[in-house]
């Protein structure tokens, strides 16, 4: 039975040209996280963090995606095209798959704030 829940940074905004941290956190389960996949609104795979093998940033995003902090992902040099949904998929044993959603809005405005529901140090 899947008892866990995914908390995410929810709806966030960030300034064009800046960077943003995407974070998901799996709680309320003792399941082992074997892999976390990060993907974009169009199903593009951004990155994978495998428990045994470490991080992989997919070739198309190597220039502006950085692993971490933690199991999160940092997007850099943001463009307006980065606006949209992002998904974290936690592959766990024995529970199975948990999926979280984040909506990022990239703003032209210089007063764009990056606000998060929670922060993981």
């Amino acid at each position: 039975m899947m008892t866990g829940t995914i908390e995410t940074t929810g709806n966030i905004s960030a300034k064009k040209g800046g960077s943003v941290i995407l974070q998901c956190h799996l709680s309320s389960t003792m399941a082992q996280v074997t892999q976390v996949n990060w993907e974009q609104h169009d199903h593009s795979l951004l990155a994978i963090r495998n428990a045994e093998l470490g991080w992989h940033i997919y070739p198309a995003f190597k220039d502006r995606v950085a692993p971490g902090p933690g199991l999160g992902l940092t997007l850099q040099s943001l463009t307006m095209n980065d606006t949209g949904e992002y998904f974290c998929t936690y592959h766990t044993y024995p529970d199975g798959t948990y999926r979280g959603r984040i909506f990022l809005e990239v703003l032209e405005s210089s007063v764009a704030e990056h606000s998060a529901r929670f922060q993981i140090p």
Epitope: E39, I48, N50, L53, H56
Partner: antibody
Amino acid sequence: EVQLVQSGAEVKKPGASVKVSCKASGYAFTNYLIEWVRQAPGQRLEWMGVINPGSGGTNYKEKFKGRVTITADKSSSTAYMELSSLRSEDTAVYYCARGEYFFFDYWGQGTTVTVSS
Amino acid sequence: DIVMTQSPDSLAVSLGERATINCKASQHVSQGVAWYQHKPGQSPKLLIYSASYRYTGVPDRFSGSGSGTDFTLTISSLQAEDVAVYYCQQHYNTPHTFGGGTKVEIK
């Protein structure tokens, strides 16, 4: 030029073990994964497991856990796959491949392992 | 494990004609699919990764598309040297799994 050169064909008896080597050249050995894939006669390709030569981290397909061991020697840029308790259904061509993480951009020439009494 | 189902099992196409191979994943794999060409007596060769990215040096007659669970490899104009078995593979999660292969022949 990237190359993966595997050891030669092996004939083993049921219950024995086999160790296949894969010598990498032409790239930074610790910057890519080494994956092991096999193909039994008339069957699809089957992924067995992977090693990160930089960290030594490994990941195995569940059905092979306890029977397969993948190792890497950084000093010689060589990866090894050892399969124990061999049975006839392990007769296959075994390939090592360089992993651009989880897809495989260069492959060894293959090593035929025959298990027969 | 994620099951990759390829269709058709075999395909006969005239030289210069289009060949289309399909691959269906048993669950969501995002764009985590690669395609390989395997000729008899040779090692497999990577053609496409991440569903639609052509690998370095692969002729542009090979293209890939799809996301989620449904994927396609297209050879736009079949050449004699394209006779081979083609495999899809999901690289979304371990264990990585391959389709059963599609044998492409000249009609």
